[in-house]
């Protein structure tokens, strides 16, 4: 695959170790933390990226209202278990034998339990709502220009086809990007919306996962779009199962 042949690096994932030990002396890159070989011609799965992050040295009205089943990642970072394809395993446990079920983007979707907790399947997150607040500008951005620029960004930077960008909503200073991708829509080779959203989130925070690629420089008709807050909501194909006490 297309790890940069000349200097053997992974352009789409800097959290890798690369060496020319692939077939025919080709550059092969493995994710930190898991040692799994990654395809450097596309995005690395969020599960492998989180695992790599945990193993790395630590550094100091037109808007959509998410429905009651929308999940926000309030639990923060954890060291996930990934399957051989790099997907999250449906059940995640910590070192103290506390377990919980996650969705395809690794966000907890049940109460925490013990080792007896069963997670029958990995439930797919089919709808992601990225809620952004941009820094003040001289005037509002033109909505259609903003829409076109964000769709182009997801295609060019994250390899996500615009057909998966369901909508871009704008009510200054709030921008909402809706990503939708049902299991039936996702063809072989299509980037997962969860992975694209994670790369975007890290880019917006100034923590780009790309190797040797400039940071995110988003402009709408030449005007810089600087994000000062991000909130991401995840909606699953099957609603989450939390007890009532969590909701009070």
């Amino acid at each position: 695959h297309t790890a940069a042949q000349d200097n053997c690096t992974c352009p789409t994932n800097k959290m890798t170790v690369c060496s020319p030990d692939g077939p025919g002396g080709r550059c092969q890159c493995r994710a930190l933390g898991s040692g799994v070989a990654v395809d450097c011609s596309t995005l690395t799965s969020k599960c492998l990226l989180l695992k790599a992050r945990m193993s790395a040295p630590k550094n100091a009205r037109t808007l959509v209202r998410p429905n009651e089943h929308a999940l926000v990642d309030n639990d923060g970072l954890y060291d996930p278990d990934c399957d051989p394809e790099g997907r999250f395993k449906a059940r995640q446990c910590n070192q103290t034998s506390v377990c919980w079920c996650v969705n395809s983007v690794g966000v907890r979707r049940t109460d925490k339990g013990d080792l007896s907790l069963r997670c029958d399947e990995l439930v797919r997150t089919h709808h992601i709502l990225i809620d952004l607040r941009h820094r003040p500008t001289a005037g509002a951005f033109n909505h259609s220009d903003l829409d076109a620029e964000l769709r182009r960004l997801f295609r060019e930077r994250y390899r996500l086809h615009p057909k998966f960008v369901a909508a871009v909503h704008y009510e200054q200073p709030t921008i909402q990007i809706e990503l939708r991708q049902n299991t039936s829509q996702k063809a072989a080779g299509d980037v997962d919306i969860g992975d694209a959203a994670y790369y975007f989130e890290r880019d917006v925070k100034g923590e780009s996962l790309f190797q040797g690629r400039g940071g995110l420089d988003l402009r709408v008709r030449g005007e810089p779009l600087q994000v000062e807050r991000t909130l991401i909501y995840y909606l699953d194909e099957i609603p989450p199962k939390f007890s009532m006490k969590r909701l009070t």
Epitope: T2, P11, T12, S41, T42, A148, R151, R152, R155, E156, R159, H161, P162, K163, A187, G189, D190, F210, R213
Partner: antibody
């Protein structure tokens, strides 16, 4: 004025290799996704390869995957198509195209084409 | 792979007439469709993308319509320079595929 000038076509034997080049001018080359499209002698258009603006992502149809490699040099404003293990069915006029900035995979400028003939 | 079927394969018309070329996709491609014109001995030129958006510099007598699986390109008041071949192409995802073309000839 947008200009795309292909070169490198010619007659090659089956199993042989050829490298096509496309010199781009009149626009900011490094901002655009680029593609190669070919036109068969029967006048059918076939998409051959696409590369995104900074060259990280490449796309191919199954018919050429593993045999053709698209690449670009943004410093030289040049697009390339390395073709190997050529077959008679690769005989065509090869066009270098610019992908519309917001039109995703619609191609808004085409070069004049370079002819490739694969024959023994 | 999405198959694109164009009709008719050829048609004859006179200057000033209005003609319509149709394109059918084998599955839903929403509005991800482009139309190209190719004159004899020349390279194709983009006319329409996203089913109905006219490319820069394309005369307003050309119009695209449709979504899902059925699309059409309409040319009002044909001009002498409009004769040639027309191709549709989906841009809904990889692989990109084209229709076989429609040859528009002077009657």
């Amino acid at each position: 004025e947008v200009k795309l000038d292909e070169s490198g076509g010619g007659l090659v034997k089956p199993g042989g290799s050829l490298k096509l080049s496309c010199a781009a001018s009149g626009f900011t080359f490094s901002s655009y996704t680029m593609s190669w499209v070919r036109q068969t002698p029967e006048k059918r258009l076939e998409w051959v390869a696409t590369i995104n603006s900074d060259g990280i992502y490449t796309y191919y149809p199954d018919s050429v995957k593993g045999r053709f490699t698209i690449s670009r040099d943004n410093a030289k404003n040049t697009l390339y198509l390395q073709m190997s293990s050529l077959k008679s069915e690769d005989t065509a006029m090869y066009y270098c195209t610019r992908v519309h900035y917001y039109g995703y995979d619609a191609m808004d400028y085409w070069g004049q084409g370079t002819s490739v003939t694969v024959s023994s | 792979e999405i198959q694109m079927t164009q009709s008719p394969a050829s048609l004859s018309a006179s200057v000033g007439e209005t003609v319509t070329i149709t394109c059918r996709a084998s599955e839903n491609i929403y509005s991800y469709l482009a139309w190209y014109q190719q004159k004899q001995g020349k390279s194709p030129q983009l006319l329409v993308y996203s089913a109905k958006t006219l490319a820069e510099g394309v005369p307003s007598r050309f119009s695209g319509s449709g979504s899902g699986t059925h699309f059409s390109l309409k040319i009002n008041s044909l001009q002498p320079e409009d004769f040639g071949s027309y191709y549709c192409q989906h841009h809904y995802g990889i692989p990109l595929t084209f229709g076989a073309g429609t040859k528009l000839e002077l009657k």
